[in-house]
Amino acid sequence: MAVTACQGLGFVVSLIGIAGIIAATCMDQWSTQDLYNNPVTAVFNYQGLWRSCVRESSGFTECRGYFTLLGLPAMLQAVRALMIVGIVLGAIGLLVSIFALKCIRIGSMEDSAKANMTLTSGIMFIVSGLCAIAGVSVFANMLVTNFWMSTANMYTGMGGMVQTVQTRYTFGAALFVGWVAGGLTLIGGVMMCIACRGLAPEETNYKAVSYHASGHSVAYKPGGFKASTGFGSNTKNKKIYDGGARTEDEVQSYPSKHDYV
């Protein structure tokens, strides 16, 4: 019962985590304009992995996709790749874990096969979670570096008295969603790996049956036939991992001239 609960909970936690990784990957708020100690503007900038957006105080929001692959920073490409790998592994892990669930009967699938699948999905969830955490952390590190670089030369002279204010970016909501989601997927994966150990059939020994020819009474002693399942008690659990992706076209949400925000 505890094994089923652990497996089920691991599945649910991973499912929530992967949904979060997908959401984070799709979100536009990976980095948002820093409003602290900055000349306040009537325009708010924020950026995602796939597009950058501008929201005016009028309510008009305009998003432009990054319609280039080669022109993008290598770090951004790396983050995209990590998130995509995380989502793909997570999705496969979910698919495998559905069939591995103890509460679901599929034909005459043995417990040993379910245990194998549970371990596989657990490893996939772990790798998926690690990918997401790594992707978000790389992006966060990139932001911190750029933040302090732009702070150092916040006001750059543009010839004479004219000044241009550099926009600084700070952590967006997607980073926190990604960290939490990656953590949940990781925890879910660990739970699946733990459940896998409980699913592996116990070793049972059948001692030899002894027949006494002299007497009429036959003594039968059950004993220890060793079941070979491929999951011995000393079998080590392995681990795996996932990420996410998505592209978006340029989107513009226009406020009607007669519809103020």
């Epitope: 306040v40 009537a42 950026q47 501008v54 309510g59 004219v162 007669h258």
Partner: antibody, heavy 117, light 113 residues
Framework: QVQLVQSGAEVVKPGASVKLSCKAS???????VHWVIQAPGQGLEWIGE????????NYNEKFKKRVTLTLDRSTSTVYMELSSLRSEDTAVYFC???????????WGQGTLVTVSS | DIVMTQSPDSLAVSLGERVTLNCKSS????????????LTWYQQKPGQPPKLLIY???TRESGVPDRFSGSGSGTDFTLTISSVQAEDVAVYHC?????????FGGGTKLEIK
Amino acid sequence: QVQLVQSGAEVVKPGASVKLSCKASGYTFTNWVHWVIQAPGQGLEWIGEINPTNARSNYNEKFKKRVTLTLDRSTSTVYMELSSLRSEDTAVYFCAGIYYGNSFAHWGQGTLVTVSS
Amino acid sequence: DIVMTQSPDSLAVSLGERVTLNCKSSQSLLNAGNQKNYLTWYQQKPGQPPKLLIYWSSTRESGVPDRFSGSGSGTDFTLTISSVQAEDVAVYHCQNNYYYPLTFGGGTKLEIK
């Protein structure tokens, strides 16, 4: 069509307060409404703005201590109260609705406030 | 605060003439996020509220005659009237719509000779 209708002209004494209104009609009352002052023969000066959705407001530091922007959603009306009036506050006060590029597409007809003893 | 400087203060032109009004800001009004300049032009006739002509430095408001055009980027902007008509006599204001407080230029008064 979109209309911003302002209250009538006011004559007030120095040190007193005045509360001007700006009633919006012909559109969804959700966008920032701005207030602008124009002294006789002078240019335009931004006073502040209020968001009818959440009543959040931003003010020009120059007017912050003396100006209060409020609203009544039930009547789609924005109010601007200016206190401690001085003779240099004699001007036409406009309310304006925001549009693309944070520009002001719709303007009230203006309210002339005369500060005189 | 951002200082908006308009030039000239006033000018008198003949009907049909081409006229250029200038506006300079003390800081760049270009937003890197969408590559748009947050500068607006208004026309104000005596006894009337201002009327929106151009936003985003070059986008003409619907209903505004096409003889009005805006250009410029960063800190230097111009409003051009390709062929001045009698009804164009007014004061023209430029506005910073990017930084708070939103600021206006002193205005340029256009008259007919």
